[in-house]
């Protein structure tokens, strides 16, 4: 009685259960009553990452330097190449097919999370007591200067974009 379903890592063809090819190998010929499935290793620039019956291996991803990409992890016969972005750039999408420059946080905003090769800068508004007067991809909101610790008084209140201005205390005679 020919099978209608096959075990894990097998496939059904011509009423036969044939072994799938292991990751890193492609199908050359299906099994028959007289022969096993024939598989061949993927070539240097190719891969297959699952048990499969593919007759062609997939081409490794190309990390195009013209798109700001570089190799983070070289592909093997079983894994694809992983690309990442050059310094100062991050992936435009999850598939990381091209890169864009990290954005800067404008004055009044500080860096909450510095950008990586795969994620953009995350900015946050400077809360009360903090400021940022620069457009930067690295600078966090800085605390206002504490005039008291310098034995000075606030002459001009700080904002989210400016520090407080300290001045000398008025001396009463």
């Amino acid at each position: 009685e020919p099978p209608t379903a096959c075990r894990e890592k097998q496939y059904l063809i011509n009423s036969q259960c044939c072994s799938l090819c292991q990751p890193g190998q492609k199908l050359v010929s299906d099994c028959t009553e007289f022969t096993e499935t024939e598989c061949l290793p993927c070539s240097e620039s190719e891969f297959l990452d699952t048990w499969n019956r593919e007759t062609r291996c997939h081409q490794h991803k190309y990390c195009d330097p013209n798109l700001g990409l570089r190799v983070q992890q070289k592909g093997t016969s079983e894994t694809d190449t992983i690309c990442t972005c050059e310094e100062g750039l991050h992936c435009m999408s999850e598939s990381c097919e091209s890169c864009v420059p990290h954005r800067s946080c404008l004055p009044g905003f500080g860096v909450k999370q510095i950008a990586t090769g795969v994620s953009d800068t995350i900015c946050e508004p400077c809360p009360v007591g903090f400021f940022s007067n620069v457009s930067s991809a690295f600078e966090k909101c800085r605390p206002w200067t504490s005039c008291e610790t310098k034995d000075l008084v606030v002459q001009q209140a700080g904002t989210n974009k400016t520090d407080v201005v300290c001045g000398p205390q008025d001396r009463q005679r």
């Epitope: 011509n14 050359v28 010929s29 028959t32 009553e33 007289f34 022969t35 096993e36 024939e38 061949l40």
Partner: antibody, heavy 112, light 112 residues
């Protein structure tokens, strides 16, 4: 029905080459390996090699590897076995087979 | 290479009586996938070999059910439950689990 029809008998001189053909019909040639087997007069069967017509993949018996070449022409559903540098001991009937179906055999005589 | 040893070399039989042929391999012929490609062929006088049994126990289509195959590892047997006159010829076992594939030396079955 499945049929494997082989080329006719050959008489060759030592040192020459012979090319035996095997025409398949009644099935898709590219789905089964073609096996080549020979049988010297009054002797048993000897496996020479196999070829998969779909991929061109081959398996050879080391004993013949340097002298035998297996090929296929899928456009005419024909497999070939070429044996070079013939010697008298190569006198035999040469069979192509799908294992479940066999050709009628080709007699190759090597004689000076 | 795997050596396939058949016994007996010659088997005189009486029609209607059972017959048994043994085939021993020099090493285990279970392949890496867990399959055993052990086949039995009959070569009738003046004919090409014909497949009887494949993968140790499977009878090829059209083969009478008086033929059966059994065994595992290194020991295999072909049984004919009731021999008929048309069963005469040379029987060969063949292993295609490990390259180079090899035939047994043959067992000649003849009527007493």
């Amino acid at each position: 029905q499945v049929q494997l029809v082989q080329s006719g008998a050959e008489v060759k001189k030592p040192g020459a080459s012979v090319k035996v053909s095997c025409k398949a019909s009644g099935y898709i040639l590219t789905t089964y390996w073609i096996t080549w087997v020979r049988q010297a007069p009054g002797q048993g069967l000897e496996w020479m090699g196999d070829i998969h017509p779909g991929s061109g993949s081959t398996k050879y018996n080391e004993k013949f590897k340097s002298r035998v070449t297996l090929t296929v022409d899928t456009s005419i559903s024909t497999a070939y076995m070429e044996l070079s540098r013939l010697r008298s001991e190569d006198t035999a009937v040469y069979y192509c087979a799908r294992r479940d179906y066999w050709g009628q055999g080709t007699t190759v005589t090597v004689s000076s | 290479d795997i050596v396939m040893t058949q016994s007996p070399l010659s088997l005189p039989v009486t029609p209607g009586e059972p017959a048994s042929i043994s085939c021993r391999s020099s090493q285990n012929i279970v392949n890496s996938q867990g399959n055993t490609y052990l086949e039995w062929y009959l070569q009738k006088p003046g004919q090409s070999p014909q497949l009887l049994i494949y993968k140790v126990t499977n009878r090829f289509s059209g083969v009478p059910d008086r033929f059966s195959g059994s065994g595992s590892g290194t020991d295999f047997t072909l049984k004919i439950s009731r021999v008929e006159a048309e069963d005469v010829g040379v029987y060969y076992c063949f292993q295609a689990s490990l390259v180079p594939w090899t035939f047994g030396g043959g067992t000649k079955v003849e009527i007493k």
